[in-house]
Interface confidence: low
């Protein structure tokens, strides 16, 4: 229904705190360089204005769209051109072009320092002093670094943060209470960020239809007892929610997500038997819980998929009459039978089925042509299964750090032109798939591995788009989203690459490395490893292992030495010489 004042409607629906949080996220995601105080001031102004509209919907400007109101606020910021360059040109446009322009200027890799967590005592002091401001800072810092973070989920993570601080700041040993809990939230939030970015990429590059197909597959796996009409309704609603969030319409997105959660909880009987626990929770927890609810038990009496989609004499007629609906039912039926497949794989199978019908239904004897389609799925299914087995075996053998290094070597050989920081970040993230997925039961590994890898590779593609340097990467990133992971997996050593010359300073280290946290030390070593591969792309695993073992030994020795500086300055050059010899 149409509301006289959109801003009043959203303020009323969401309540003051969520309204303010979402407006803060929106501004932080659009203008990523502004300080918290600058954004907090804008948020307060918008909130005050919303309240005047709640009091009187006919008040001046209350009938304006949210894009107009927010855009006008952003465009009124002093020194916009000095701080944001050509983003300021967006302000010369009218809506809806102005908002589109803002969206195009979102930076997936802003040059902001890493978000450093203050030490426990300081954190608790500022949290206790003003919890609202503390949480505001959290929302701002995460949102500006992750401009596509799913806004209602970010409110959920802020709430988790709040609850952890509430609990741990009351403990004697705050540090040991906070660290593991906040690390856990950070890890989950980072995964949530790359997953959501993938959804927005799908929406931006391939439109709503592609996203809806993703949603149908995912929902069918989770709710195999829901009928096709129910799944279609949920997929349509979920597509709308994600479209809004990806498009910067965060108030509408959060409001519609709450509506969807409400609908699901009111219709559990026709959706799933597993929703009750989620539905008992308050809003943010409820929506989060529903988004990762366990799969319902599959119906025992499902007929073979071939009956309706291969053996039926009317396959081509049904396909011709309503292509999207027929393909949708195929995706639904196949997905509900295969919770053990990744969504990417299910979409590849649906694409293969569609291509087969396109070809065969134009032939004289279609059934003879499409009769073998299910058998043709086999290689498509085997490829990711082998990927999972090979990689999980390697992870179990090497552990997370060693597995990351193996991936780093592999990907540096595939795309040596890519910047070392990007390769290291990608390999570290890809390597986490082991810890995340390889410990799961067999039937959950494939969906976990492949859908996570796809999300990480999407980030690689986004970073590469900014500065394209590798034809290999461009080729894999230009295709459809579901083909990306197989494309990257199939890449081999880039034969066109001219090896980097050996620079001693790249492999020269100082005693400051000794005091770095373990994670930073690992990154330093992995940076050196990528540089080694760029110098010798065809070095054997054995050669690289020799060099890295030598390097680790050197660090260990010098960091334990009484005079660290002298050790580094005398032993360092020897290490460099040995490295060159080992790789010669």
């Amino acid at each position: 229904e149409a509301h006289k004042s959109e801003i009043a409607h959203r303020y009323n629906d969401l309540g003051e705190q969520h309204f303010k949080g979402l407006v803060l996220i929106a501004f932080s995601q659009y203008l990523q360089k502004c300080s918290y105080d600058e954004h907090a001031k804008l948020v307060q102004e918008v909130t005050d204005f919303a309240k005047t509209c709640v009091a009187d919907e006919s008040a001046a400007n209350c009938d304006k769209s949210l894009h107009t109101l927010f855009g006008d606020k952003l465009c009124a910021i002093p020194n916009l051109r000095e701080n944001y360059g050509e983003l300021a040109d967006c302000c010369t446009k009218q809506e809806p072009e102005r908002n589109e322009c803002f969206l195009q200027h979102k930076d997936d890799n802003p040059s902001l320092p890493p978000f450093e967590r203050p030490e426990a005592e300081a954190m608790c002091t500022s949290f206790k002093e003003n919890p609202t401001t503390f949480m505001g800072h959290y929302l701002h810092e995460v949102a500006r670094r992750h401009p596509y973070f799913y806004a209602p989920e970010l409110l959920y993570y802020a709430e988790q943060y709040n609850e952890i601080l509430t609990q741990c700041c009351a403990e004697a040993d705050k540090e040991s209470c906070l660290t593991p809990k906040l690390d856990g939230v950070k890890e989950k939030a980072l995964v949530s960020s790359v997953r959501q970015r993938m959804k927005c990429s799908s929406m931006q590059k391939f439109g709503e239809r592609a996203f809806k197909a993703w949603a149908v597959a995912r929902l069918s796996q989770t709710f195999p007892n829901a009928d096709f009409a129910e799944i279609t309704k949920l997929a349509t609603d979920l597509t709308k929610v994600n479209k809004e969030c990806c498009h910067g319409d965060l108030l509408e997105c959060a409001d519609d997500r709450a509506e969807l959660a409400k609908y699901m909880c009111e219709n559990q009987a026709t959706i799933s038997s597993k929703l009750q626990t989620c539905c008992d929770k308050p809003l943010l927890k409820k929506a989060h819980c529903l988004s990762e609810v366990e799969h319902d038990t599959m119906p025992a009496d499902l007929p073979a998929i071939a009956a309706d989609f291969v053996e039926d004499q009317e396959v081509c007629k049904n396909y011709a009459e309503a292509k999207d609906v027929f393909l949708g039912t195929f995706l639904y039926e196949y997905s509900r039978r295969h919770p053990d497949y990744s969504v990417s794989l299910l979409l590849r199978l649906a694409k293969k089925y569609e291509a087969t019908l396109e070809k065969c239904c134009a032939e004289a004897n279609p059934p003879a042509c499409y009769g073998t389609v299910l058998a043709e799925f086999q290689p498509l299914v085997e490829e990711p299964k082998n990927l999972v087995k090979t990689n999980c075996d390697l992870y179990e053998k090497l552990g997370e750090y060693g597995f990351q290094n193996a991936i780093l070597v592999r990907y540096t050989q595939k795309a040596p032109q890519v910047s070392t920081p990007t390769l290291v970040e990608a390999a570290r993230n890809l390597g986490r798939v082991g810890t995340k997925c390889c410990t799961l039961p067999e039937d959950q590994r494939l969906p976990c591995v492949e859908d996570y890898l796809s999300a990480i590779l999407n980030r690689v593609c986004l970073l590469h788009e900014k500065t394209p340097v590798s034809e290999h990467v461009t080729k894999c990133c230009s295709g459809s989203l579901v083909e990306r992971r197989p494309c990257f997996s199939a890449l081999t050593v880039d034969e066109t690459y001219v090896p980097k010359e050996f620079k001693a300073e790249t492999f020269t280290f100082h005693s400051d490395i000794c005091t770095l946290p373990e994670k930073e030390k690992q990154i330093k070593k992995q940076t050196a490893l990528a540089e080694l591969v760029k110098h010798k792309p065809k070095a054997t695993a054995e050669q690289l292992k020799t060099v890295m073992d030598d390097f680790a030994q050197f660090l260990d020795t010098c960091c334990k030495a009484a005079d660290k500086d002298t050790c580094f300055s005398t032993e360092g050059p020897n290490l460099v010489t040995r490295c060159k010899d080992a790789l010669a």
């Epitope: 309540g15 705190q17 969520h18 949290f127 206790k128 002093e129 003003n130 919890p131 609202t132 949480m135 709430e159 709040n162 609850e163 601080l165 509430t166 609990q167 700041c169 009351a170 308050p282 943010l284 927890k285």
Partner: nanobody
Framework: EVQLVESGGGLVQPGNSLRLSCAAS????????MSWVRQAPGKGPEWVSS????????LYADSVKGRFTISRDNAKTTLYLQMNSLRPEDTAVYYC????????SSQGTLVTVSS
């Protein structure tokens, strides 16, 4: 274990007053800011008011400013909300929360304002 127990709700006529209490236990009460949040039937949670750990700083939603007063007694580990000039639109379940959270972790107390 953190526990928050609200009391003091009830049915009142418009213009009258009520005083809500929230007894807290299981954490260092004086170290935490506290809030009152309310949820009207069929609506989302709405923040009402907050108070700092020391009790020096208070904040109010515009809808209650000048009518409601938040306070605390750290010795008794209790939070209060004095509600004057009550209106029908104040009808809701009121619950207290730690920090600025809107998450409900207690039963709450129902306030009904009706003639």
């Amino acid at each position: 274990e953190v526990q928050l127990v609200e009391s003091g709700g009830g049915l009142v006529q418009p213009g009258n007053s009520l005083r809500l209490s929230c007894a807290a236990s299981g954490f260092t009460f004086s170290s935490f800011g506290m809030s009152w949040v309310r949820q009207a039937p069929g609506k989302g949670p709405e923040w009402v008011s907050s108070i700092s750990g020391s009790g020096h700083d208070t904040l109010y939603a515009d809808s209650v400013k000048g009518r409601f007063t938040i306070s605390r007694d750290n010795a008794k580990t209790t939070l209060y909300l004095q509600m004057n000039s009550l209106r029908p639109e104040d009808t809701a379940v009121y619950y207290c929360t730690i920090g600025g959270s809107l998450t409900r972790s207690s039963q709450g107390t129902l306030v009904t304002v009706s003639s």
